[in-house]
Interface confidence: low
Amino acid sequence: AGSDSLYVPCAPSPCVNGGTCRQTGDFTFECNCLPGFEGSTCERNIDDCPNHRCQNGGVCVDGVNTYNCRCPPQWTGQFCTEDVDECLLQPNACQNGGTCANRNGGYGCVCVNGWSGDDCSENIDDCAFASCTPGSTCIDRVASFSCMCPEGKAGLLCHLDDACISNPCHKGALCDTNPLNGQYICTCPQGYKGADCTEDVDEGNSHHHHHH
């Protein structure tokens, strides 16, 4: 080549990423790389992740002479070592009056009576543990249940015989069953009294309730 096309190794500099070129011979050069880079022209970023300290499931993301940790949602901080307080971030994390309890790497809900599930959104099926008498129908409620009794049965658990079945109340009186003991209660029409509403009452008296 002519003198007008002389090769000068460091002009222009072949070193990239801030590397400094040093001519070592007529046609040779050496690149002094900035921290975080390697290769004959400093073209390669050194992977800092083999020595990473990302914790708790954090994923290492290489940087220039450094690395960052991409943390799972439950963790934060430079190395994913700081617990995220989900209870602060999500005030409504627990439903139906449940209390949020922050934990290392997550959170939990302390549910009020009658609710269950991770976020207290599931109504506990109280009928699963109910003792309604066979033949009756259990109805689940929040933290309780009720028993729908078949004809002839009464009481909270339908475990009592319905005393109204024998029509003990006379004169068109209304018959109710005491859910605690199964006894009938007659609500007498005007002018009658007594357990069965069979007695006349004095003028001026109105409805009477009689328990039996």
Epitope: P50, H52, G57, G58, C60, Q78
Partner: antibody, heavy 120, light 107 residues
Framework: EVQLVESGGGLVQPGGSLKLSCAVS????????MEWIRQASGKGLEWIAA??????????VYSASVKDRFTISRDTSKSTLYLQMNSLKTEDTAVYYC???????????WGQGTLVTVSS | DIQMTQSPSSVSASVGDRVTITCQTS??????LAWYQQKPGKSPKLLIY???RLQDGVPSRFSGSGSGTDYTLTISSLQPEDFATYYC?????????FGGGTKVEIK
Amino acid sequence: EVQLVESGGGLVQPGGSLKLSCAVSGFTFSDFYMEWIRQASGKGLEWIAAQRNKANDFSIVYSASVKDRFTISRDTSKSTLYLQMNSLKTEDTAVYYCSRDGGKWGLDAWGQGTLVTVSS
Amino acid sequence: DIQMTQSPSSVSASVGDRVTITCQTSEDIYSGLAWYQQKPGKSPKLLIYGASRLQDGVPSRFSGSGSGTDYTLTISSLQPEDFATYYCQQGFKYPLTFGGGTKVEIK
């Protein structure tokens, strides 16, 4: 209760091999980084090997002093950490500890240690 | 590798004394430092992690402080059971490295 119990130490000739075991219990083994640290008599602590957790593919790091001679591994089904030591030198004589990396820059559980003596 | 310079190498103190041990690192370790206590024939016990956080079950007379490259372990009122060797350790980058240790002896 977190427990780590090392075994397998003993007397071995220079150039020989030895395999140390560390049986762990009381925590989910695959969730934690595990480390081997050694201590020569009357000297300080020297970290020699680590195995990251399952989330980090159980990848491995060694100190320059044992690289290519020692191998760290674990059997999660047996909840046991191992250190296979080959081409042993007299300067490898030490008490070897396995420890659990608690995830916040601290080694929060240690075994009782097992003595390895390399001598002819 | 990150170099750990711990001082003093030994200290003589009496029960009730305040004892301070320092650890200097060769580069910023962003509070990634732990302190351990070791008694003869026993394995090390974690006292402080993350430069200043007290490990569960460790008495509150132990405290840690510092940032960047300079860290300190303080025992506010030395108790008979505290006579032991103490080590600092950086957990910021592999290889993990330890300080040379500080032996706390009875005066």
